[in-house]
Amino acid sequence: EPPTACREKQYLINSQCCSLCQPGQKLVSDCTEFTETECLPCSESEFLDTWNRETRCHQHKYCDPNLGLRVQQKGTSETDTICTCEEGLHCMSESCESCVPHRSCLPGFGVKQIATGVSDTICEPCPVGFFSNVSSAFEKCRPWTSCETKDLVVQQAGTNKTDVVCGPQDRQR
């Protein structure tokens, strides 16, 4: 009785179960009743990452430097190349097909999380007691200067964009 379903790592063809090709190999010819499935290794620039019956291997991803990409991990016959972005850039999407410059946090905002090759800068508003007076992809909100510790008094209150201005105390005689 011809099978209607096959075991794992097999496929059904011409009423019989044939072995799938292992990762890193492509199908050359199906099995017969007497002869095993014929598979061939993918070439150097190609890969297949699953047990398969593909007649062509997939091309490794190209990390295009013109799009700000570089190779993070070289592909093998079983894995695709992994691209990441050059310094100062991050992936535009999950598939990382191109890169964009990291976002800078505007004055009044500080860096909560520095950007990586795959994620953009995360900014946060500077809370009371902190400020940022620069547009930066690295600078966190900095605390206002403590005038008291310098034996000074606050002459101008700080904001989220400016530090406090300290001045000498008025000495009363």
């Epitope: 011409n14 010819s29 199906d30 099995c31 017969t32 009743e33 007497f34 002869t35 095993e36 014929e38």
Partner: antibody, heavy 120, light 112 residues
Framework: QVQLVESGGGVVQPGRSLRLSCAAS????????MHWVRQAPGKGLEWVAV????????YHADSVKGRFTISRDNSKITLYLQMNSLRTEDTAVYYC?????????????WGQGTLVTVSS | DIVMTQSPLSLTVTPGEPASISCRSS???????????LDWYLQKPGQSPQVLIS???NRASGVPDRFSGSGSGTDFTLKISRVEAEDVGVYYC?????????FGPGTKVDIR
């Protein structure tokens, strides 16, 4: 290149046994079905038996069924034909041949053959 | 069992002339995948058989293109467009449609 070398032939008396071997090289033996085909002196070709790559399927011609057994040892890269209860009509050159698979079903590469003579 | 017949059983040809051999099977050799499971072999004098044609019409690697196979179902033909001296020998058809595999009786080709 594919090479098949048969051995084990010779002169044997009727009713006796003989085991033929076929040493393979130049291809992945464990992936291919294998055949035995024979040719009586001055006669045509007669298919004898076939065995699948992992031994799960084997078939024999009616003329040898119950007397001859095809087998293989993939670790030794060798095909065998165990011949029991030999008859004078089994006298022939015995060829081993590789099965061509889906692109060329049937024997595609043949050995040079080994002569078996059954005579009293 | 499938019975194979060939005609003619003997053929003498002039070098450079065409030759044709017919092969018939007692059952259809056409499989559901669209292929005819018929092979042609040549056995040169003192040598082992060599495959010429597989699946009715597929020339085996290294076989000169003067050899061609055609036909379907139960009727098949092997043609040699221009016979050469090295083509002498016995030509066999064989069915690989089902076990037991069976050969035709052979066609002996000689050069005039």
């Amino acid at each position: 290149q594919v090479q098949l070398v048969e051995s084990g032939g010779g002169v044997v008396q009727p009713g006796r046994s003989l085991r033929l071997s076929c040493a393979a090289s130049g291809f992945t033996f464990s992936s291919y079905g294998m055949h035995w085909v024979r040719q009586a002196p001055g006669k045509g070709l007669e298919w004898v038996a076939v065995i699948s790559y992992e031994e799960s399927n084997r078939y024999h011609a009616d003329s040898v069924k119950g007397r001859f057994t095809i087998s293989r040892d993939n670790s030794k890269i060798t095909l065998y034909l165990q011949m029991n209860s030999l008859r004078t009509e089994d006298t022939a050159v015995y060829y081993c041949a590789r099965d061509g698979g889906i692109a060329a079903p049937g024997p595609d590469y043949w050995g040079q053959g080994t002569l078996v003579t059954v005579s009293s | 069992d499938i019975v194979m017949t060939q005609s003619p059983l003997s053929l003498t040809v002039t070098p450079g002339e065409p030759a044709s051999i017919s092969c018939r099977s007692s059952q259809s050799l056409l499989y559901s995948n669209g292929y005819n499971y018929l092979d042609w072999y040549l056995q040169k004098p003192g040598q082992s058989p060599q495959v010429l044609i597989s699946l009715g019409s597929n020339r085996a690697s290294g076989v000169p293109d003067r050899f061609s196979g055609s036909g379907s179902g139960t009727d098949f033909t092997l043609k040699i467009s221009r016979v050469e001296a090295e083509d002498v020998g016995v030509y066999y058809c064989m069915q690989a449609r089902q076990t037991p595999f069976t050969f035709g009786p052979g066609t002996k080709v000689d050069i005039r």
